[in-house]
Each structure stands twice: as structure tokens, then as C-alpha cells.
């Protein structure tokens, strides 16, 4: 007989495009030895899994590299990690534990993942005042980006003389040496999420003081 178990937590989760979400899953505490097998996450109605730890099983092209089964039977963990969320990931998913040698396995309840438009925008921080002729470091940050996602691409646009400084997964530094004529001009930080094909930007007006 196919055995059923309930996924703990909410029946649906929301994630913004390009970001990450963890679909929580805990294996049943009483798991007969013969039922132990590989773990598979399925999109409702599909035969090919979106994620698995079965070395002989293919996963859906659309989710390869973005959906991962977090497998740790010692901690009863069978959670699904989704990164670089895309609009078409919007669906119901369920987990199945099964050995290919056995007729039956364990199937979880369904959980819906809702993928919304990205509403977060980059932050631009300026340390103090911008002085004409003096270099200053501006930081464009996206603190809401998850570390395990595909690193975003940062682009800066400004008429002022600039040079790129260090960057991390979540931030990019721009060194700017403003001139008097750069006062009230626009500076834009554009962030693209290549995993989901989404671009967000923030524009500020430069306030340059004269030395």
C-alpha cells in the first residue's frame, strides 16, 4: 500500500522571481527499512521529477540546477530548495520516497509554490557627502538575495568619472570622483538576475558639494 504523510507547515509558499525558497519536508519518523529508497520531488501531474538524489534518474530540464533535494535522513530532512525562481515554477509539488524495486513508497501531501513579480529594489548607500574632486565609495546592495542563487549582475550608469570596486553576491562598490558639473545628475545601479531573467534598478540624484 502506498503510504501517505503530511508536509508540515503552510499549504503554500510565496517567492519573488529570481529569489530562493525552501519547501520544508520531514520524513516520517516510522519508516520501514524496506520502504527506504531514493527521494523524488514532483510537479503535480508530471512523471519526471524536478529534483532527486537517484543517480539513474533524469530531472526536468526546466528545473535542473535550480531545484535541489536537501537529503539528510538522519535529521529526517527531505526539503526542496528552489533558487532563481521563475514564473513558470508557479505550481503544486509533492515528495515521494521510493525504491525502484518496491511497488509502493511514501508520498507527501502537496504544497503550492506561488511565484510573484520581484518588488524588491536595490539600495544605494552613500557615505556622507560627495565632494567635488574627492573619491567616494558608493555601494549598491541587494540584501534580500540568497547566497545559493546565481549571483546577480551589477551595472552602474553615471556621467561622473567612476571605477568599479569589490563586489560580493549581494553588493557592488563603485568609486566615484564627482566634478562640479555632476551635481544633480543621475546615478543608476541596475541589477540583473540571470537565473530568472529579471532586472531591477534604482536611480539617485548626485548631490555634489564644492571644495
Amino acid at each position: 500500500q502506498e503510504r501517505r504523510f503530511q508536509l508540515e507547515g503552510p499549504e503554500s509558499l510565496t517567492v519573488q522571481e529570481g529569489l530562493c525558497v525552501l519547501v520544508p519536508c520531514r520524513l516520517p519518523t516510522t519508516l520501514p527499512a524496506s520502504y527506504y529508497g531514493y527521494g523524488y520531488w514532483f510537479l503535480e501531474g508530471a512523471d519526471v521529477p524536478v529534483a532527486t538524489n537517484d543517480p539513474d534518474e533524469e530531472v526536468q530540464e526546466e528545473t535542473r540546477g535550480r531545484f535541489h533535494l536537501l537529503w539528510d535522513p538522519r535529521r529526517k530532512n527531505c526539503s526542496l530548495s528552489i533558487r532563481d525562481a521563475r514564473r513558470r515554477d508557479n505550481a503544486a509539488y509533492f515528495f515521494r520516497l521510493k525504491s525502484k524495486w518496491m511497488k509502493y513508497g511514501y508520498t507527501s501531501s502537496k504544497l503550492s509554490v506561488r511565484v510573484m513579480a520581484l518588488t524588491h529594489r536595490p539600495n544605494i548607500s552613500i557615505p556622507g557627502t560627495l565632494e567635488s574632486g574627492h573619491p567616494s565609495n558608493l555601494t549598491c546592495s541587494v540584501p534580500w538575495v540568497c547566497e545559493q542563487g546565481t549571483p546577480p549582475i551589477f551595472s552602474w550608469m553615471s556621467a561622473a568619472p567612476t571605477s568599479l570596486g569589490p563586489r560580493t553576491t549581494q553588493s557592488s562598490v563603485l568609486t566615484i570622483t564627482p566634478r562640479p558639473q555632476d551635481h544633480s545628475t543621475n546615478l543608476t545601479c541596475q541589477v540583473t538576475f540571470p537565473g530568472a531573467g529579471v532586472t531591477m534598478e534604482r536611480t539617485i540624484q548626485l548631490n555634489v558639494s564644492y571644495a
Epitope: Q1, L31, P32, A33, S34, Y35, Y36, G37, Y38, N53, P55, D56, W71, D72, P73, R74, S99, K100, W101, M102, K103, Y104
Partner: antibody, heavy 116, light 107 residues
Amino acid sequence: EVQLLESGGGVVQPGRSLRLSCAASGFTFSSYGMHWVRQAPGKGLEWVAVISYDGSNKHYADSVKGRFTISRDNSKNTLYLQMNSLRAEDTAVYYCARGGQTIDIWGQGTMVTVSS
Amino acid sequence: DIVMTQSPSSLSASVGDRVTITCRASQSISSYLNWYQQKPGKAPKLLIYAASSLQSGVPSRFSGSGSGTDFTLTISSLQPEDFATYYCQQSYSTPYTFGQGTKLEIK
């Protein structure tokens, strides 16, 4: 009570054939994967073959591939191992065992001796 | 094929001792590791599956740990009935290979 009872073992000459049977009782045989595991005298366990619940999927150890065939008859609750072209190194106790990726029930074994 | 290597091959211990047997896989097998106990003239018996899950009816003095390539079976306090041969087996991919065994003897 879950039980597996092997039969068909005996003494056979090299190159000859032998068919082992395993009668299952106490569980829904047609829902379980089944294995054959062998143990040469004084040696360790050697996994031989596995068959899926419906017989559609089979895998073998390299040492027996092409010579041994695992099969099942779910209507008779019986597992089989057809052993052809037997060699001296096939001499062992053959265990029938239940399970998927984990063997949880074992039979008591049947002895196969390949000798001229 | 995945090669399973157990150590030690044999081990002498006394009742009440804490004993650890290790098993190493030639490649990562995640948590797909089972431990069996076999007494002379008897069929093997499942002790631990999924590297650390205790089979129903097996005393809690037996425990398993590990993931990837390195695994251990621990008997916290040896009892007279624990003197036997222990085998690890990987069930990650066929052929489902066994370790060569560890014979646990009375000191």
C-alpha cells in the same frame, strides 16, 4: 510470520545448471523487491542479484552476469535463481532475501556445491 | 562498482566494552549504507539502515553514523550475544556490494 524458504541446492558438476527456488509467506510478495545473496564457505557475503516487485527490473553482480537469471512468479509467491555454466567458485550458501534498497528479511539459505 | 572496505577485519573485546567498526566506500554513497550481523551457521540480520536508522527490534546499544564515504557502527556496551561477524553494505547503486566483514571475538 514473515518467512523465506530456499530449496534446490545440492552438488552439481562444473558447467552444469541448477535452479534455486524461494517460497515466501507472511507478507504481500508481489509488493516487494527480492534479492539473492551468497556466501562461499568461510568467506563474506556477496550480493548476487535483485528483481523488482513485478519482475520488470533486474540487476546482477558482474561475477554472475550472463550465467544466472533471477525471476519470480507472483501468483506462486516464489522467487527463482536459474544458474547456468556453474563454476567451482559458485560454491556457496545462497540466501533469498526481501527488500528494496535495504534487505530486511533473509531466508536460512541453501547450499550449492560445484564439484567434479 | 563501489568497493566497501571495513576495518578492522577482526576485533577482540570484552563484555561491557564500547566497540566501533568502520566502513569506507570507494565513492560517495550518501546515506545508503546498511549494517548486518551474522552468527555462525545463521542468516544475516539487519541492524541499521540508511546509515543511522535502527531496525525495529534491534537493541539501542547499536548505533550507526556517517554519510558520503565514511561510516561507523558502534556498540555502546558489548553483550555476550553481540559476538558475531558484522557486514556493511551499500545500497546506493547496483551491484549492492558488501564489505569484507569484521569478526568480533571475545577477548
